[in-house]
């Protein structure tokens, strides 16, 4: 029963998080919500970085800044690869949930 | 004072390759950015792509990948780019220029510009 | 991608006259972030390097006379004005996007009248 509890919270963070994306950055409470995850979890979009590609406001060569290993204004435009947090913040927060929920 | 040295002007075949150098001097070559630009005769400015000293990092225009690598060598501040199976399109002045940062992507300083002919 | 258009292709002007130029982007390069323009203006002169005049759009690099002014805070119409034109100033201008990826305009060519 466990289990199956942890993956219907998996799922519905999941869910929830690129719902959230959606709305970035036009919402400026969603932004704040999401860029502070992303700073604190070292993640960047939800399985990773390029799904913030198929978000409509933001261009191919974007993330948000909260995704920089360096956060600084601007930092998330034409970024590199190397310049950014690759992995997704589902699993990553996720981790977490699983070690302190 | 700042300067962006290029290497000298290239003659090259139909098909081979060419690398050219740009010695970055008179500031701390990892705390900018270096970008690529070409210019063919009486044209317009295109940018081919950046490489980041400080991570290594890279981004390409579109156009430009398979034909560019970017890459550079630390202990002597050069970047280097090279380009590939050349054919007369490739035919232009290619500059070197840095900016602060890739976002903040403004070319402070340009390098003179290196020559690449392409003709059998 | 994000297009530039600059206009017109060529001016020809007198010395001490003033010129406008412009540049129209097919997209917002305005971030909301900081607010600011993520626009450049470049000078070409022959046989030369470009050199960069304006950044942020209106923000004059260090050593570039005040005759150059860049405005425009739409985010996708800005221009480029240079009083008393001098003969030194006869050249290539071109607008640059730094928003998403780079692209330059066409450019503009001052000539001599």
């Known amino acids: 029963a466990g289990y199956v509890f942890r993956d219907k919270v998996m799922s519905e963070f999941n869910n929830n998080f690129r719902q959230q994306m959606e709305n970035y950055p036009k919402n400026n409470h969603t932004a704040s919500i999401l860029d502070r995850m992303q700073a604190d979890f070292k993640c960047c979009g939800a399985a990773n970085y390029t799904d913030w590609e198929k978000i409509p406001s933001m261009s191919k060569n974007r993330v948000p800044d909260s995704c920089c290993i360096n956060v600084t204004v601007g930092c998330g435009i034409n970024f590199n690869e190397k310049a950014i947090h690759k992995e997704g913040c589902v699993e990553k927060i996720g981790g977490w949930l699983r070690k302190n929920v | 004072q700042v300067q962006l040295q290029e290497s000298g002007p290239e003659l090259v075949k139909p098909g081979a390759s060419v690398k050219m150098s740009c010695k970055a001097s008179g500031y701390t070559f990892t705390t900018y950015v270096i970008h690529w630009v070409k210019q063919k005769p009486g044209q317009g400015l295109e940018w081919i792509g950046y490489f980041d000293p400080n991570n290594d990092g890279t981004k390409y225009n579109e156009r430009f990948k398979g034909k560019a690598t970017l890459t550079s060598d630390r202990s002597s501040s050069t970047a280097y780019m090279e380009l590939s199976s050349l054919t007369s399109e490739d035919s232009a002045v290619y500059y070197c220029a840095r900016s602060r940062t890739y976002y903040d992507a403004s070319m402070d300083y340009w390098g003179q510009g290196t020559s690449v002919t392409v003709s059998s | 991608d994000i297009w530039m258009t600059q206009s017109p292709s060529s001016l020809a002007v007198s010395p001490g006259e003033k010129v406008t130029m412009n540049c129209k982007s097919s997209?917002?390069?305005?971030?909301?972030?900081?607010?600011?323009?993520?626009l450049a203006w470049y000078q070409q002169k022959p046989g030369q390097s470009p050199k960069l005049l304006i950044y942020?759009?209106?923000?004059r690099e260090s050593g570039v006379p005040d005759r150059f002014t860049g405005s425009g805070g739409s985010g996708t119409d800005f221009t480029l004005t240079i009083s008393n034109i001098q003969t030194e100033d006869l050249a290539v201008y071109y607008c640059q996007q730094i928003f998403s990826s780079y692209t330059f305009g066409g450019g503009t060519k001052l000539e001599l009248k």
């Open positions: 997209q917002s390069v305005l971030y909301s972030s900081n607010q600011k323009n993520f």
């Open positions: 942020w759009a209106s923000t």
